[in-house]
Amino acid sequence: APVRSLNCTLRDSQQKSLVMSGPYELKALHLQGQDMEQQVVFSMSFVQGEESNDKIPVALGLKEKNLYLSCVLKDDKPTLQLESVDPKNYPKKKMEKRFVFNKIEINNKLEFESAQFPNWYISTSQAENMPVFLGGTKGGQDITDFTMQFVSS
C-alpha cells in the first residue's frame, strides 16, 4: 500500500511551537490564542526503516508544501535543513535516509532521532525565537523532547 501520512503539530517540552522563519528554516517560540495559527503543520509519513515498539521511522514534511526535514553533513557536522523535493515522487515508502527520523516515545515525551546520524536529535534552544536544529546531546541545555498533536486533514 502507498505511504500513509497524518497531519500533526509539534511543541517542545517548554510548550514552544514551531513556525516558519524564512523559506527554509523553522524556529521555536511561545504562541498563544490566534497566533497558534502560525504554527507549522507537518505531514508525518510512516516510512520504511528499523522499527520497534518504542521506535517508529517517519518522515516530516510540511503540509501542502514540497519541503521535508532532512539531515545532511555541512562543514562535517550533522545539520537539519528543509529540503525541497519533487512533489510527484514524495512522500514515498522508501524515503532516502536523510529524510528519516526515528520517532521515539519515552514516558510522555517524543524524540526525533536522525536515522542518518544516530544520537542526533531534532532540537530547540531554551531561548525564544531560535532556529530548530539537529543536536548531538540529550539532557543538556538544548531541548530534544516534544509532544505531538495530530490534527484533522
Epitope: A1, P2, R4, F46, E105, K109, M148, F150
Partner: antibody, heavy 119, light 107 residues
Framework: EVQLVESGGGLVQPGGSLRLSCAAS????????MSWVRQAPGKRLEWVAY????????YFPDTVKGRFTISRDNAKNTLYLQMNSLRAEDTAMYYC????????????WGQGTLVTVSS | DIQMTQSPSSLSASVGDRVTITCRTS??????LTWYQQKPGKAPQLLIY???TLADGVPSRFSGSGSGTQFTLTISSLQPEDFANYYC?????????FGQGTKVEIK
C-alpha cells in the same frame, strides 16, 4: 485475557463536566496506544480521542477539540477522558479501545459507559 | 473528511446463507480499512483489518476484499452467532470515520 472496563458515565446537565475512566488488564498497558470511541443512540460510531502509549501524542476531532482532554496513568493501568462544556449531542455510549501502534485499527474494546447530557 | 457509506443498511438472511456487505468511501483509502462486528448491548469486535486480513480468533467464514474506494465483507455461510451489526472504518487520514452500520437480522 485483555479487559477494558469503563466507568464514570451518568447524567449531567448541559455545560457540565464528567471524567470517564477505563481500567485495563491482561496486557502491558504502557506499550499500547489507546482511544475513546462513542456511539450516540441510532448513530454511527465516532472516534473522539486518542493518546499514544506514553502520552506524548494526542488527537481530538473538531467536534470535541477544546472541550475534551485525554490522559493516562500507566502506573495505574488507567485511561481517562475529561469532558467539559458538555452538550446534548455528546449523549452517547463511550467505549475505550486499544489501538495499534501506528494509529490504525482498534483491536480490543470495553463494554462502554453511558453519558447522558440533559437538563 | 472521508465519508463512509455502507450498503445495505439492513438485511434479513437465514442460517447458511452467503451474505455480502459493501463499504464505499468518498476518497481513495487504498487498503486502510477495518471491519467490526457489534452484537446488541456489547462492545464492537475487530473482524478484519487492512481490508482482508482476518483478526485473531475470527472464523474463516468471514472474508474481506477490495481496495481504493470499494470494499466488501462476506460471510460465506451465516451462523446464528453472526446476527449483529457490522461497521467499516478507514484509517487512511484523520479523522478515521466509520460507516453507518449494517444490521444483519434473522429472516
Amino acid at each position: 485475557e485483555v479487559q477494558l472496563v469503563e466507568s464514570g458515565g451518568g447524567l449531567v446537565q448541559p455545560g457540565g463536566s464528567l471524567r470517564l475512566s477505563c481500567a485495563a488488564s491482561g496486557f502491558d498497558f504502557s506499550r499500547y496506544d489507546m482511544s475513546w470511541v462513542r456511539q450516540a443512540p441510532g448513530k454511527r460510531l465516532e472516534w473522539v480521542a486518542y493518546i499514544s502509549s506514553g502520552g506524548g501524542s494526542t488527537y481530538f476531532p473538531d467536534t470535541v477539540k477544546g472541550r475534551f482532554t485525554i490522559s493516562r496513568d500507566n502506573a495505574k493501568n488507567t485511561l481517562y477522558l475529561q469532558m467539559n462544556s458538555l452538550r446534548a449531542e455528546d449523549t452517547a455510549m463511550y467505549y475505550c479501545a486499544r489501538q495499534n501502534k501506528k494509529l490504525t485499527w482498534f483491536d480490543y474494546w470495553g463494554q462502554g459507559t453511558l453519558v447522558t447530557v440533559s437538563s | 473528511d472521508i465519508q463512509m457509506t455502507q450498503s445495505p443498511s439492513s438485511l434479513s438472511a437465514s442460517v447458511g446463507d452467503r451474505v455480502t456487505i459493501t463499504c464505499r468511501t468518498s476518497g481513495n483509502i487504498h487498503n486502510y480499512l477495518t471491519w467490526y462486528q457489534q452484537k446488541p448491548g456489547k462492545a464492537p469486535q475487530l473482524l478484519i483489518y487492512n481490508a482482508k486480513t482476518l483478526a485473531d480468533g475470527v472464523p474463516s467464514r468471514f472474508s474481506g476484499s477490495g481496495s481504493g474506494t470499494q470494499f466488501t465483507l462476506t460471510i460465506s455461510s451465516l451462523q446464528p452467532e453472526d446476527f449483529a451489526n457490522y461497521y467499516c472504518q478507514h484509517f487512511w487520514s484523520l479523522p478515521f470515520t466509520f460507516g453507518q452500520g449494517t444490521k444483519v437480522e434473522i429472516k
